[in-house]
Structures are given as structure tokens and as C-alpha cells.
Amino acid sequence: KDDDDKVPQLYWDDLKKMLSEKLDTTDFTSTIKLLNENSYVPREAGSQKDENLAWYIENQFRECKLSKVWRDEHFVKIQVKDSAQNSVTITGTNSEFVYLVENPGGYVAYSQNATVTGKLVHANFGTEKDFEDLDSPVNGSLVIVRAGKITFAEKVANAESANAIGVLIYMDKTKFPIVDADVSFFGHAHLGTGDPYTPGFPSFNHTQFPPSRSSGLPNIPVQTISRAAAERLFENMEGDCPSDWKTDSSCRMVTSQNKSVKLSVSNVMKEIKILNIFGVIKGFVEPDRYVVVGAQRDSWGPGAAKSSVGTALLLELAQTFSDMVLKDGFQPSRSIVFASWSAGDFGSVGATEWLEGYLSSLHLKAFTFINLDKAVLGTSNFRVSASPLLYALIEKTMQEVKHPVTGLSLYQDSNWASKVEKLTFDNAAFPFLAYSGIPAVSFCFCEDTDYPYLGTTMDTYKELIEKIPQLNKVARAAAEVAGQFMIKLTHDVELNLDYERYNSQLLSFLRNLNQYRADIREMGLSLQWLYSARGDFFRATSRLTTDFKNSEKTDRFVMKELNDRVMKVEYYFLSPYVSPRESPFRHIFWGSGSHTLSALLEHLKLRKTNNRAFNETLFRNQLALATWTIQGAANALSGDIWDIDNEF
């Protein structure tokens, strides 16, 4: 590479300035507008308009002159509304009258198809605590819950756990101040991600897997209803809702004695072809190591905030970075993969299918995922959810980027990391982190309240620009945040992943566990091995930091070896003791299932609060496997096996 000397070395300040100047001249609003034209809307996954937009994005990537552009096809099962309408009716207990409340315009994908009748009980947001706090038992009853706080899938799972027979979801005016009470909306009820009929494995056309079904699918019917329909139901219900719910005054708790509610759902399964579109800017030093930047393309309604903003950011970042490389001399060491996913509305299906297709190798190559979905939902706050490995990078970026309206740095709170919320099922970053063990980040400019139109027919460009008149400025700031992440992750010799952060995560877990040391002693168990594993992890991170300090930054082979050790940290927090098919989200910190550290704590709590539900054998297993997972992470980080202290 004799030409290397001729390329002027670009430093962080040069690249930051270059990015900023390019973004200053980018018209994000017109791209968002374009993506909401009739030819691309509505673009439900697998529809012609979804495919139209896929072709457009592929062409844009080619016009950007990315190193390579390609597509992945997947054949997945989704659920759509049948021509026979779903219905909610009120009946007399002896069927002496029948009153149609609504044939809803929206629906909940992956609902169980059934007709159920019973009393209707309000369960607030449908959280576990909401069900625990209810005076009326819900077993054998339908429940009505407000949208918000947790995903539809979690609401339904909680209702099912409480033995409810069906779920109605509505948007109350207090939390979702939409003028039109008739607005219909959509969601899905799969407590998981990806195609629920190929759980843990990819749905390429040539994979001959036997029929399978995700355990995260509900066994009860669920339906979204308009606020107007909810109010009609409340007129036939009694008991004011608690004032601490802070909801509409029309809210009522339980159906009147002589009345029942009937829910009928008859959605249909449909196999569709979805397209994931990819483009890559190849790295100059380690092209086989890459950061993935992705956005959901599909949408049930117009999807301006839900998918157009993220897709616009994806397209503009691809153009910006391509220009930086081809025209301005930026030579990223590592590659950048731009990804446009489909079927995001059905539970990050496109993204998860890609991850499932490359499960065994992706974590060795992809070292970070940056999610652009729903990056602009307001202006007041900057919020972020991410793997702790990315906290240092996020903090540096927050210090560098100015708020688009106030002009102040985004870094306003030195305690921001303690307020970071866990990634949830409905975020495409979740399967990257919890399923594949790839550090992931998702962020947004937003308000204290939810953006009211997500998932509704009112998620239009018009509503977006009226809610956020400074849309261009805010989108520019979102692009700058993502862009700085991308530069820092691909430019620096040392991989910008703060592996030492997991020390405090482990310490925090041990502190929580320590509260129950009496219980642990009573079971004849000890936390010694867990402390030992945590100590080994701490020593491994310290040693790695020392190795980095002592290494020659210009020695590419040494740096690659060290960076590869860093890349494995997240992956080694995936429990090796559970099957990716049965428990796909294996991450012990951020996943879901009995192998997680939070599940271990919740289970241990039961020993005092509900002893009959506590299973000592299960707990012993949980403790042992958690210990070994942490020890395994420490060993992996230490490097070669002859460097590992085997006294454990």
C-alpha cells in the first residue's frame, strides 16, 4: 500500500467537521416527504409498495456508489385482517340484546383466532403490577387495557398469565391526545422477534425446517379498538378508574352485572416475501469487521414517524459517508453496512431473520448495531437505550453534538447512564443485543409523552411536520449522533467498546443479590463462586486495558487480536446453557427467560413473598449457570487458555 503515504491523515476533529458540514447541506425533510408519497404508502410488509420502496432504496444505494449493494429474500408468515370483520359486541347475559360496539379498522397481528364472551375488566396498562393490583379477578374474563408503557405482546402475555380469555387495547385521550376518537391502530402480539413460525432459525426459501411455533405467540384473542368504542364499552361498565391511573374521566372498571362483552377475531395467516436491502462501504484495514446501521422500511399505516424518518436517515447517511470516502479522503478502517429491513411492524422480522441466518458467524464480524427507527418523535429530550459497551461512546457523542433547538450540548446530566432504559422487544436493536450478542444502540429525540400517532392511520407526514416544525434540524441532529457513532467505531485503531462497563453491571447485580444472602445461606449455598467469577472478569478487563496500553498502535496484527477479544465480550454474556430455539434471547443481562440475572433475582424474591411459587432446584440451577456464564465471559476476555487461572 505505497499510496497510503499520499493520503493526508484525517483526525477526529477533521472528520467531525467534515460530517457536520455535509449534514448542514442535507435536506432531510424532503427525503422524509418523498418516502410518504402515495407510491410508497401504505407499505405493509410484503406489499407492492413495500417492494417499490425496496427497489428505490437499492437504487439509491447504487447511486451513492457504495462498495456493494445486495438484497436478502425471506419468506415469512404474518397475520392480516380477514375480509370477515373482527367485532366487539355487548350482549345481555341471556343474549336478550346484542349491540355492536365496533368492527375495528385496526387489528393485532398474531392474535389467536377465537370468539370469546365474558365480563370485561379494566387492567390499566396491563403490566404485571396492574394485574396484581386489581380488585376484580380476571380469570375467565376479557380485559381492556390502555396502549402504552409496555408492548402489546407483554400486555397479552400478562393477561394470559392471569387467565383472562381475551384482550382489548385502546388509546386513552389523556396519554394519546388524538382529536379523532375513531382512529384505528395496529400492533402485534408476538412476545419475541422474527417470524414466529420459524423460531430460532431463518426463513430462507430453501430451509426445510419442520413446522414450528414460537412459545411467544398468544393463546387468546386480542384486538385494538378506537377510543370511541372504548367509551361505548365504558357506558356499559361500572366503578370509576383509580385517580392515580391519570386517565380519561369516562374510564370504568367492570361490566354491569347483566352485560357481557363478546370479542370475535378471525385474522388470516399469510406467507409473504420480504426484502432486506443492504449496502456496504468497505473498510480499508479490516473490511471483515463492520458496524451495521439499520432502519425499518415497512409500515401498516402511513408510518411517517415510524419508518420514513429512519429510512430517510439511512439514505442520507449512506450518501454522506459515501461522499466522505470517495471525495474527501475518509478511510474507515472497518466496514459500514447499511440495512433496510422489512416486516419490522410484525416484530423486527427482517432484522431477526438476517441475524438467524448468520447466527454462528455474525458476532465475529458485526461489532455494533445502530438503530435509526423512530429517531425523531419530538424535540425536548434526547433518549438512548444501549449495551453498556457503548456508554462511553454515547457519552463522548452527547458531549460533541448540540441540541438542534437549544444549541446546548446533549450531555446535560452526568448521571444519564443510570437512567438508561433497557431495550424492549419492539426495538430492532433488541435481537442484535439479546439474541446475537452484538452491542446495539437505539436513540431518539422525543417528548416526555408518547408520540401519539405511532401505529395509527394518522402517522402521516402532515402530522409529523406539524408536531415537529423543526423536523429538518432534529433529523440533522439525529444523523449527526449516528454519524459520530459510525466514525468513532470505524476510524479509531482501538475498538470503541467500553468492556470495563460490565464491571459495574456485575457489581450492581451482586449488590442486589447480596440482599438475599440469608436466603442463600439457608439453602446451604454460597456466593463465593459468583464473587470469584466477577473478580476474574474484573481482572480480565484490567489486563486487557494494560495490553492495549502496552501495545504498539501501529501493529495491526496485535491490535486486531486485542479488538477481537473486545468484540467477544457481549457474545459471551449469552447463556450457553439454553437453546437459541427455545430461549432465543440468551443474554443474561438484557435477554428474557429464566437464565437471565433479573429472572434469578425475581425468582429468589419469591422465597419470602410467595414460597409456594419458589423452586429451590430451579434456583440452584439458575445460580450455577449464571456463575459459569460470567466465568466464561471472564475466560474469553483473558485471551488464550494458557493465560487463564484455572483455580476456579
Partner: antibody
């Protein structure tokens, strides 16, 4: 074929009332928002009022707020404009217009009636 | 309240290109529509969503919108295009029309 037919215009004294109707055919009336637009003699178009498909939401220009009321009867496929406290400046041709669906939310007026003349004069 | 400004008149020779502008604060952030109205007739939608033509509208009609200005362009103008042209945009739940431009084909 979509057709909009206005009626009910005429001569009325200042302070008087008038009710305009717009009979619609050739489309699913209840699925579309409808609007009234007027045009004073020799002047441009001025939006007066709009109503959602279900009739649950109504919107007015500041110049007519509190005096005009828009309504619809979806069973009769008919749009109405009740005009009270009429003034000389309300003299115009009144058009009813269908609001087409646009994915962006910026719905265009894709079909217009032929208009009905309203004259407010003493 | 939101305002849209149009030139009162524009003249063009047959076969030439006519451009009619419509300006409003950050109009490029909204979608603009254009209507044609011939004497004694009702308005007809000629452009929606900045640049889309409804079926039946000749290809010589085109539109664009960026910054603070939307433009209606008629290429190869014909005598039959002589009419008043109105731009229109939404401001929240209300509709705003421009003052109208009289296009004269010389």
C-alpha cells in the same frame, strides 16, 4: 362517476339565514371528508369549512366561525352548510368539494360541485 | 394565520413554458396542490402532492416545491390553458388558498 350537486342558494338579507345542501353520488360518501369553498365575485377561492367522514369533526375558517355550521347525513349522502347572521361579505358562489385521500395527510380536493350562488343584500 | 402569495398575472406565448409561483413560509415542508379554473366553471385539480398529476391531466403540467416556493410549470402552453390557477396548502386543520394567478396565452 363522482357527482356533487349543490342547492339552496339564493338572495337573503343581512342577518338572515340560509341552508346549503350538497347531494353526492358515485362514491362511498361516508369514507370521505367534505369541504365548502366559496368564491366572491371577481375574487379568488376561500376555504369555508370542512367535516370528517363520520361527521365527528368539523373545522371552520375564522371568518365564519360561530356563524356557520357544517354537517352531513351519511344515510342520505348529503352535506349541509347552515349559514346564520349572514353579511354582505358572505356573497359568493359556494362550492362543495370532496377531500381525496393522500398518504401524506395533505389531502387534495379532487372533485368539486358546480356551485350555488348566495347573495346577501338588503 | 398562514398565507400563500401568487403573482396576479402571468403571460406566455403559445408553445412556450409558463411558470406560476406560490410562496409561503416553509411551504417546501408542506405538500402543495394546484387548481385550474376557467371562467364560469368549477376548479379542477391539476397537481397534488407537489408534483403528481391526477389521471386526465396532460403531461405538460408539472409541479415542484422546495424552500418557501411551490411552482406550477406548463410546458408547451396551449390556448386552452388560459385560466386562473390557485395553489393550496394545509395549515394544521385549515385549508389555505393562494390569491390566484391569471394565465394569459398571448
Amino acid at each position: 362517476e363522482v357527482q356533487l350537486l349543490e342547492s339552496g342558494g339564493g338572495l337573503v338579507q343581512p342577518g338572515g339565514s340560509l341552508r346549503l345542501s350538497c347531494a353526492d353520488s358515485g362514491f362511498t360518501f361516508s369514507s370521505y371528508a367534505m369541504n365548502w369553498v366559496r368564491q366572491a365575485p371577481g375574487k379568488g377561492l376561500e376555504w369555508v369549512s370542512g367535516i370528517s367522514g363520520s361527521g365527528g369533526h368539523t373545522y371552520y375558517a375564522d371568518s365564519v366561525k360561530g356563524r356557520f355550521t357544517v354537517s352531513r347525513d351519511n344515510s342520505k349522502n348529503t352535506l349541509y352548510l347552515q349559514m346564520n347572521s349572514l353579511r354582505a361579505e358572505d356573497t359568493a358562489v359556494y362550492y362543495c368539494a370532496r377531500e381525496g385521500y393522500d398518504s401524506s395527510g395533505y389531502n387534495p380536493f379532487d372533485y368539486w360541485g358546480q356551485g350555488t350562488q348566495v347573495t346577501v343584500s338588503s | 394565520s398562514y398565507e400563500l402569495t401568487q403573482p396576479p398575472s402571468v403571460s406566455v406565448s403559445p408553445g412556450q413554458t409558463a411558470s406560476i409561483t406560490c410562496s409561503g413560509d416553509k411551504l417546501g415542508d408542506k405538500y402543495a396542490c394546484w387548481y385550474q379554473q376557467k371562467p364560469g366553471q368549477s376548479p379542477v385539480l391539476v397537481i397534488y402532492q407537489d408534483s403528481k398529476r391526477p389521471s386526465g391531466i396532460p403531461e405538460r403540467f408539472s409541479g415542484s416545491n422546495s424552500g418557501n416556493t411551490a411552482t406550477l410549470t406548463i410546458s408547451g402552453t396551449q390556448a386552452m390553458d388560459e385560466a386562473d390557477y390557485y395553489c393550496q396548502a394545509w395549515d394544521s386543520s385549515t385549508v389555505v388558498f393562494g390569491g390566484g394567478t391569471k394565465l394569459t396565452v398571448l
